[in-house]
């Protein structure tokens, strides 16, 4: 599952909220990033997160599609210099500062079940979710194709404005 | 190789419906969202929806809501598009497309079937 | 919905030219359009994709550019068998909408 190119294909700021329109939260505590799951006060504001998408051979292609069988995976920064990475021994979800290139770890499978929500899967971890778990975002095994509608690893992305990629 | 065969021309009433299908071939048909596009002469190029074999997920363009029902058939790999309560305004080719990504719509049209030439006359 | 203006409608150019076509949204886009080529009694076939990235099998001479509002699909020395409709899209957001179109007609 190579990444084709070193530069993301196109880039995205936009707030992420649960299915349920729970707000996920940045916070700094301690020189290291928390993040939660919460319900926000009305005129709060929610934080925004640079979506990068790249493109990235299918590791088979044994659907026949050849050169086409393409995914996107996508990087999620908060923040500059930290990004979302797939914890798959803790089954967690952290933000962690990399430095470009960064680890598998940080790269998820983007999925649209829906036409208005994603999904991502773990790179590292095929089949292993970002989902929501006791107001906290955690990794969560889905195990058929059929529990990928499952509401708690669906999340909706509110573009507040594209990112120019240089 | 990827492909996207389509049924062949209808001359139909109006008032009457059409449903024409989209049978396909060379890729894992449940894991791509299949749109359809509209060409006439009138309007150019009109995306009308698309459809998720995998949840049966759909997507709409407002201005073919209650015109357009789409759905798919797994065990064949063949999507299918109904449109009804047809008038002058629904004779165009009509053509079912794929895009490039596995598990995601960006609504890029990466593969087109050949369309189907829909004609509406009493 | 975003409204895409192509211009000019059609062109006439000799083979080995250069042209370029342009497509202008009424909004915003970022990078999110595409290229399509169409010649008579075919379907459309994707050329470019976020705006600069070039399809699987399509020629290098076909050249994606422009960000925002304001793109550019440039043909770099023309073949006879570029003779065709050229349509601009806007992706990634529902509803997708396209341009109508620049013709190129070869001298």
């Known amino acids: 599952m190579s990444i084709t190119g070193i530069s993301p294909i196109t880039e995205y700021l936009a707030s992420l909220s649960t299915y349920n329109d729970q707000s996920i939260t940045f916070a700094l505590e301690d020189e290291s990033y928390e993040i939660y799951v919460e319900d926000l006060k009305k005129d709060e504001k929610k934080d925004k997160v640079l979506l990068s998408y790249y493109e990235s051979q299918h590791p088979s292609n044994e659907s026949g599609d050849g050169v086409d069988g393409k995914m996107l995976m996508v990087t999620l920064s908060p923040t500059k210099d930290f990004w979302l990475h797939a914890n798959n021994k803790e089954h967690s979800v952290e933000l962690h500062k990399s430095e470009k290139p960064l680890p598998d770890q940080a790269f998820f499978v983007l999925h649209n079940m829906h036409s208005n929500s994603v999904s991502f899967e773990s790179k590292t971890d095929p089949g292993v979710f970002i989902g929501v778990k006791d107001n906290h975002l955690a990794l969560i095994k889905v195990d058929s194709s059929e529990n990928l509608s499952t509401e708690n690893i669906l999340f909706k992305l509110s573009e507040t404005h594209h990112h120019h990629h240089h | 190789q990827v492909k996207l065969l389509q049924s062949g021309a209808a001359l139909v009433k109006p008032g009457a419906s059409v449903k024409m299908s989209c049978a396909t071939s060379?890729?894992?048909?449940?894991?791509?969202?299949v749109s359809w596009v509209k060409q006439s002469h009138g309007k150019g190029l009109e995306w009308i929806g698309e459809i998720y074999p995998n949840s049966g997920a759909d997507n709409f363009n407002e201005n073919f809501k209650g015109k357009a029902t789409l759905t798919v058939d797994k065990s064949t790999s063949t999507a299918y598009m109904e449109l009804s309560r047809l008038t002058s305004e629904d004779s165009a080719i009509y053509y079912c497309?794929?895009?490039?990504?596995?598990?995601?719509?960006?609504?890029?049209?990466?593969?087109w079937g050949q369309g189907t030439l829909v004609t509406v006359s009493s | 919905n975003i409204v895409m203006t192509q211009s000019p409608k059609s062109m006439s150019i000799s083979v080995g030219d250069r042209v370029t076509m342009n497509c202008k949204a009424s909004?915003?886009?970022?990078?999110?359009l595409a290229w399509y080529q169409q010649k008579p009694g075919q379907s459309p076939k994707l050329l470019i994709y976020y705006a600069s990235n070039r399809y699987t099998g399509v020629p290098d001479r076909f050249t994606g550019g422009g960000y925002g509002t304001d793109f550019t699909l440039t043909i770099n020395s023309v073949q006879a068998e570029d003779a065709a409709f050229y349509y601009c899209?806007?992706?990634?957001?529902?509803?997708?909408?396209f341009g109508g179109g620049t013709k190129v007609e070869i001298k």
């Open positions: 909004q915003n886009v970022g990078n999110n």
């Open positions: 497309t794929r895009g490039p990504y596995y598990y995601s719509t960006q609504i890029i049209f990466a593969y």
């Open positions: 899209q806007r992706i990634y957001n529902s509803p997708p909408t």
């Open positions: 060379g890729f894992s048909f449940t894991d791509y969202w």
